[in-house]
């Protein structure tokens, strides 16, 4: 009685259960009642990541430098290449097929979360008592200078873009 289903890591062909090729190898010829499945290793820059009956290996992903991509993890015969973005850039999608420049936080805004290879800079407005006078992808909002701790007084109030200006206290004559 020919089988209608096969065990794990096998496939049914010509009323017969044949062994699948292991990851990193492709199918050359199906098994017969006299011979085992014939498999061949994937070539350089190719891979197969599952037990399979594929006759062609997949090409490793190409991390195109013209799109700002570089290799994060080199592919093997069993795994695909993983791309990431160059320093200062992040992926435009989960598949990381191209990159965009990290956003800078404008004056009056500080960095809440620094960008990574997969996420952009998150900015936040500087609250009262804090300022940022630069456009930066790294700088947080800085607290206003405390004039009192320096035994000085506020001569000019701070804003979300400027620090306070301290000056000497008026002396009573």
């Amino acid at each position: 009685e020919p089988p209608t289903a096969c065990r794990e890591k096998q496939y049914l062909i010509n009323s017969q259960c044949c062994s699948l090729c292991q990851p990193g190898q492709k199918l050359v010829s199906d098994c017969t009642e006299f011979t085992e499945t014939e498999c061949l290793p994937c070539g350089e820059s190719e891979f197969l990541d599952t037990w399979n009956r594929e006759t062609h290996c997949h090409q490793h992903k190409y991390c195109d430098p013209n799109l700002g991509l570089r290799v994060q993890q080199k592919g093997t015969s069993e795994t695909d290449t993983i791309c990431t973005c160059e320093e200062g850039w992040h992926c435009t999608s989960e598949a990381c097929e191209s990159c965009v420049l990290h956003r800078s936080c404008s004056p009056g805004f500080g960095v809440k979360q620094i960008a990574t290879g997969v996420s952009d800079t998150i900015c936040e407005p500087c609250p009262v008592g804090f300022f940022s006078n630069v456009s930066s992808a790294f700088e947080k909002c800085h607290p206003w200078t405390s004039c009192e701790t320096k035994d000085l007084v506020v001569q000019q109030a701070g804003t979300n873009k400027t620090d306070v200006v301290c000056g000497p206290q008026d002396r009573l004559r």
């Epitope: 991390c63 700002g68 080199k74 160059e86 320093e87 850039w89």
Partner: antibody
Framework: QSVEESGGRLVTPGTPLTLTCTAS????????MGWFRQAPGKGLEYIGW?????DPYYASWVKGRFTISKTSTTVDLKMTSLTTEDTATYFC????????WGPGTLVTVSS | DIVMTQTPASVEAAVGGTVTIKCQAS??????LAWYQLKPGQPPKLLIY???TLASGVPSRFKGSGSGTEFTLTISDLECADAATYYC??????????????FGGGTEVVVK
């Protein structure tokens, strides 16, 4: 959009020399930039290129003699230990497949 | 390094004719191949990239094909202005770690 090389001149062997590539009409920040050369009567030769993030990659024959660096407006090729074999027209180009090339700058190494 | 071998070194054809230039890579470069036209005293001009994509402003008389290790540039309806030296170039990397941008030796096209 264009690029232009500068800094080529007559030097004696062993003299260091820096060539500069200046971009017009686009920012170098979002592009790979490459350096290439052509010696008199010879074919095109790849020297190296620099990535978005400033990582340089070189042809195997360069062996540390040349260094590529970039700012937001220029790409430099610093050359040391020059020999007469380095006499060539040096080109800079945008992208790994050179979609925009400069006119080239001539470097002559002679004693 | 990957070696790019270009054939023939020189080819002659009549105006209106067709020229075929071949480029062979010593190992697979997928479709990362460019073709350039070079005339004396001028910078190289990009004709084709990614093996078959026509560069901006290049007439459709220029056609690139191939992948892996075998590539071809075909120039049809030859014009006098096509007289130049043509180069192929691997514009990708050989492995995930080693970037190479190697040129072929060039093919001189003479138009009669």
């Amino acid at each position: 959009q264009s690029v232009e090389e500068s800094g080529g001149r007559l030097v004696t062997p062993g003299t260091p020399l820096t060539l500069t590539c200046t971009a017009s009409g686009f920012s170098l920040i979002g592009y790979v930039m490459g350096w290439f050369r052509q010696a008199p009567g010879k074919g095109l030769e790849y020297i190296g290129w620099i990535s978005f993030g400033g990582d340089p990659y070189y042809a195997s024959w360069v062996k540390g003699r040349f260094t590529i660096s970039k700012t937001s407006t220029t790409v430099d090729l610093k050359m040391t230990s020059l020999t007469t074999e380095d006499t060539a027209t040096y080109f800079c180009a945008r992208s790994t497949y050179g979609d925009i090339w400069g006119p080239g700058t001539l470097v002559t190494v002679s004693s | 390094d990957i070696v790019m071998t270009q054939t023939p070194a020189s080819v002659e054809a009549a105006v209106g004719g067709t020229v075929t230039i071949k480029c062979q890579a010593s190992q697979s470069i997928s479709s990362r191949l460019a073709w350039y036209q070079l005339k004396p005293g001028q910078p190289p001009k990009l004709l084709i990239y990614s093996a078959s994509t026509l560069a901006s402003g290049v007439p459709s008389r220029f056609k690139g094909s191939g992948s892996g290790t075998e590539f071809t540039l075909t120039i049809s309806d030859l014009e006098c202005a096509d007289a130049a030296t043509y180069y192929c170039q691997n514009h990708g990397y050989a492995t995930s770690e080693s970037y190479t941008n190697t040129f072929g030796g060039g093919t001189e096209v003479v138009v009669k």
